[in-house]
């Protein structure tokens, strides 16, 4: 058993049918010695008396808010949560496996630049009695500071019969140098509590590996005289690290017909302009990627050919 | 990345082309190592990230773009002496460059070159003959060092009398390649920045 926060405790259980469970001793936080009784949750049934209460915690029915009283007055509370270990592996019931970029990916994180700011998000089908708390650091043995905000519900979508909820959090490394070469990964730890179930999820990454630039901005077309060709131009996104000559991007320019089946013409360039043939009803899209470190491409920025 | 890449024209900052070749070569070598050594811990998540140049060179600090010198987190031990030799820059651009930066890059390359050559000698003794260092990568390191044109005493190749542990050598190769790829990215950024200056 360990303390998650004041008066909230996590009991770790080897989870299998007929498991013996864990013996837990609760102590009433009071100078009183006599006339103390214990109850669980809203029940008035007295579970025991005395300053300490010994219980065998086996299942969720044994978890909850234990309260000690004296003469009708509440003295203190202890909330017991359960953390299930199933055959040597901590349970992952609360969050959905996003399966991207690989199986068992519960937390996904992205950064728009090298400033040390990043966003993580996760998915769940649970809509109520759910709380998250997020901590982060650079490295684990001698951790350096990363500050995270509160996790917030950022999207809701319907998937088949189920509703899916997306939560996200923004974090910022306390003293980040955009040009630094990372040797210690960022660690992100999310504590999830659903009713009386506790779970924790972690992700470990280098900022350089989670970079995904914003799409190029100010995408414009300039027709070339007496030609089907157009000059496409764009700019680096505002959120990208500066100076751009140091943090350079490379670009992919795509001409896509109205039909998805039509052949796509693609050009790769390090410049912020390109000359392409603009077909009728086609659209021109441009996306960006770090020129020197192949992390994710940005989403496409698009303009119609007409 | 199999993209069409424009070849820089000869008027460009001469080291830019070499540094781009370096990054391509080390990235290819790392990809080859990951595939060949699939049963070894060779991915970024599995290896310890060690920097053999730590406390010996200061490339990131020495080559920091002027725009980032206002960022206190970037200023660990920045020294600001300006370039006095090295042939990478045309003379009119010399004043924009710090000697420490290019010499630091040169020292990095020299240290990695020695490590890679020592390692290759060990890998050649492996009865499995599983993996060797790409000669192209070693040649590209050499070309960039020559383009930098710094005079520095040669570091003797380390020789080891004891029987090599090939498992450890292959893991060390992965660690080295990961670190060298990261340094090659920094070198490319620096060259691109200097080229634009």
């Amino acid at each position: 058993i360990w303390e998650l926060k004041k008066d909230v405790y996590v009991v770790e259980l080897d989870w299998y049918p007929d498991a013996p469970g864990e013996m837990v001793v609760l102590t009433c936080d009071t100078p009183e010695e006599d006339g103390i009784t214990w109850t669980l949750d809203q029940s008035s049934e007295v579970l025991g008396s005395g300053k300490t209460l010994t219980i065998q915690v086996k299942e969720f029915g044994d978890a909850g808010q234990y309260t000690c009283h004296k003469g009708g007055e509440v003295l203190s509370h202890s909330l017991l949560l359960l953390h299930k270990k199933e055959d040597g592996i901590w349970s992952t019931d609360i969050l959905k496996d996003q399966k991207e970029p690989k199986n068992k990916t519960f937390l996904r994180c992205e950064a728009k630049n090298y400033s040390g700011r990043f966003t993580c998000w996760w998915l769940t089908t649970i809509s109520t009695d759910l709380t998250f708390s997020v901590k982060s650091s650079r490295g684990s043995s001698d951790p350096q500071g990363v500050t995270c905000g509160a996790a917030t519900l950022s999207a809701e979508r319907v998937r088949g019969d189920n509703k899916e909820y997306e939560y996200s959090v923004e974090c910022q490394e306390d003293s980040a140098c955009p040009a630094a070469e990372e040797s210690l990964p960022i660690e992100v730890m999310v504590d999830a509590v659903h009713k009386l179930k506790y779970e924790n999820y972690t992700s470990s990454f280098f900022i350089r590996d989670i970079i995904k630039p914003d799409p190029p901005k100010n995408l414009q077309l300039k027709p070339l005289k007496n030609s089907r060709q157009v000059e496409v131009s764009w700019e680096y996104p505002d959120t990208w690290s500066t100076p751009h000559s140091y943090f350079s991007l490379t670009f992919c320019v795509q001409v896509q017909g109205k039909s998805k089946r039509e052949k796509k013409d693609r050009v790769f360039t390090d410049k912020t302009s390109a000359t392409v043939i603009c077909r009728k009803n086609a659209s021109i899209s441009v996306r960006a990627q770090d020129r020197y470190y192949s992390s994710s491409w940005s989403e496409w920025a698009s303009v119609p050919c007409s | 990345r199999n993209l069409p890449v424009a070849t820089p024209d000869p008027g460009m900052f001469p080291c830019l082309h070499h540094s781009q070749n370096l990054l391509r070569a080390v990235s290819n070598m790392l990809q080859k190592a990951r595939q060949t050594l699939e049963f070894y811990p060779c991915t970024s998540e599995e290896i310890d990230h060690e920097d053999i140049t730590k406390d010996k060179t200061s490339t990131v600090e020495a080559c920091l773009p002027l725009e980032l010198t206002k960022n206190e987190s970037c200023l660990n031990s920045r020294e600001t002496s300006f370039i006095t030799n090295g042939s990478c820059l045309a003379s009119r651009k010399t004043s924009f460059m710090m000697a420490l930066c290019l010499s630091s890059i040169y020292e990095d390359l020299k240290m990695y070159q020695v490590e890679f050559k020592t390692m290759n000698a060990k890998l050649l003794m492996d009865p499995k003959r599983q993996i060797f260092l790409d000669q192209n990568m070693l040649a590209v390191i050499d070309e960039l060092m020559q383009a930098l044109n710094f005079n520095s005493e040669t570091v003797p190749q380390k020789s080891s009398l004891e029987e090599p542990d090939f498992y450890k050598t292959k893991i060390k190769l992965c660690i080295l390649l990961h670190a060298f790829r990261i340094r090659a990215v920094t070198i490319d950024r620096v060259m691109s920045y200097l080229n634009a200056s």
């Epitope: 299998y16 049918p17 199933e86 055959d87 | -």
Partner: antibody, heavy 115, light 112 residues
Amino acid sequence: QVQLVQSGGGVVQPGRSLRLSCAASGFTFSSYGMHWVRQAPGKGLEWVAFIRYDGSNKYYADSVKGRFTISRDNSKNTLYLQMKSLRAEDTAVYYCKTHGSHDNWGQGTMVTVSS
Amino acid sequence: SYVLTQPPSVSGTPGQRVTISCSGGRSNIGSNTVKWYQQLPGTAPKLLIYNNDQRPSGVPDRFSGSKSGTSASLAITGVQAEDEADYYCQSYDRGTHPALLFGTGTKVTVLG
């Protein structure tokens, strides 16, 4: 004590269907994940499928994906394996088992796919 | 498609020490716990070892398990006639959990 009693096995022609059941008692069935494991005659153990305690997630071996469906009825304390498009290579003893560091197995039920 | 490899058979005389190896990789045994099962003819498998080296109550202490890196082993110290059976190791793969990965199985024969 924990008990898993299996039923539903038998002889079936290729291409036909069969449903296996596993009745649980002696524990809170709705709190635990469950597996199906099979063993072809004279061969080793092969995992078939898994279902979460609440039925929310199901996992299958590639060899049965799209043909077999694992399900559970927590109100009846019963686990099921619906097998469709059966093939000769599905001939095996099928076991249900609880998920956990200490596990309990059903007695097994023989499924024979033969024309 | 077994990824946990065991020797097909091992044998020993009563009282001898018999060991069965189970060889895997970084993503399975290297990252997860190992179990060992004993299966007597015509019966369901019985758990002998969980969590690499733990014995459930009721399992004789002549059975012991260990794990090192990407391999595990089961030792029977002082093998007895009633130990003649098939033995299977089991683990998980970190990418496909909760799918059970079973070893190829080892037939233990007690001679004499």
